[in-house]
């Protein structure tokens, strides 16, 4: 089941999936001056079986001006630099993505891909948030969001993260006030059947990741 919306936006933060659940789709898009080859795929799809998951289809771009110049190679470092994705800025090496069953790792870049990747997530997907450079995290809970199915509708849980500028001194007095639930909603609202496939395994993953995501920023 596709998530109806995108993950929530947190001011001065970016999100990233560490692995993509089977069923996730990625737009095949090209940067300005290039277009998908005519017979090329519109989307990549994370598919697999119980033992192995991988991305079906390949995205291929060709110059808008010249025809039939289709190459499938990894961009040079300077090309990669300009890609504005939802990837986090600081280097992190969390849990091995391949170790999560039923998930695909980040697809490798394709030549002349667009500067932003558009993913279409499925229920059970978890994304992790980190403050952008120049901002620091004030935690009130997990800095992650999960796409859940509730009452037949999909929604993303609210990440408990505030990003504040380094110069700001307001420390939110009494910051550690407990929340009613991780989503910041009363439990009564979410008491019906909730589908969160792989939630436990990803929560454990998040716990091991917590250190790597939020310490690299200040080293």
């Amino acid at each position: 089941e596709l998530c109806d919306d995108d993950p929530p936006e947190i001011p001065h933060a970016t999100f990233k999936a560490m692995a993509y659940k089977e069923g996730t789709m990625l737009n095949c898009e090209c940067k300005r001056g290039f277009r998908r080859i005519k017979s090329g795929s519109l989307y990549m799809l994370c598919t697999g079986n119980s033992s192995h998951s991988s991305w079906d289809n390949q995205c291929q771009c060709t110059s808008s001006a010249t025809r039939n110049t289709t190459k499938q190679v990894t961009p040079q470092p300077e090309e990669q630099k300009e890609r504005k994705t939802t990837e986090m800025q600081s280097p992190m090496q969390p849990v091995d993505q391949a170790s999560l069953p039923g998930h695909c790792r980040e697809p490798p870049p394709w030549e002349n891909e667009a500067t932003e990747r558009i993913y279409h997530f499925v229920v059970g997907q978890m994304v992790y948030y980190q403050c952008v450079q120049g901002y620091r995290a004030l935690h009130r809970g997990p800095a992650e969001s999960v796409c859940k199915m509730t009452h037949g509708k999909t929604r993303w849980t609210q990440p408990q993260l505030i990003c504040t500028g380094e110069m700001e001194t307001s420390q939110f007095p009494g910051e550690e006030k407990p929340q009613a639930s991780p989503e910041g909603r009363p439990e009564s609202e979410t008491s019906c059947l909730v589908t969160t496939t792989d939630f436990q395994i990803q929560t454990e993953m998040a716990a091991t990741m917590e250190t790597s995501i939020f310490t690299t920023e200040y080293q």
Epitope: L2, D5, E29
Partner: nanobody
Framework: EVQLVESGGGLVQPGGSLRLSCAAS????????MAWYRQAPGKQRELVAT???????TYADSVKGRFTISRDNAKNTVYLQMNSLRPEDTAVYYC?????WGQGTQVTVSS
């Protein structure tokens, strides 16, 4: 889930025009690459035209210069303007986004 509903098909004479519409719901429309496919009796479904999020378009050689795909993100709708229609354009036309398909709309070009 994405719901797609096509409209605008019908019977038209060779050389005539039709405008197909496809209304999408259930997902943020502006994030979707939209496509029109068609399937003639006894033939495989073929890609007619696509439109990216930024408006970039691609067409099958057989319709280039005659068909125009466009989108209105405010209305969550994609269009296929078909001019100079030929008998060989007769088919059921399907709207597509992600792995989702509309029910199809019949286009018949005949005198």
């Amino acid at each position: 889930e994405v719901q797609l509903v096509e409209s605008g098909g019908g019977l038209v004479q060779p050389g005539g025009s039709l405008r197909l519409s496809c209304a999408a719901s259930g997902r943020k429309f502006s994030t979707l690459i939209m496509a029109w496919y068609r399937q003639a009796p006894g033939k495989q479904r073929e890609l007619v035209a696509t439109i990216e999020r930024d408006g970039t378009t691609t067409y099958a050689d057989s319709v280039k210069g005659r068909f125009t795909i466009s989108r209105d993100n405010a209305k969550n709708t994609v269009y296929l303007q078909m001019n100079s229609l030929r008998p060989e354009d007769t088919a059921v036309y399907y709207c597509n986004a992600l792995q989702y398909w509309g029910q199809g709309t019949q286009v018949t070009v005949s005198s």
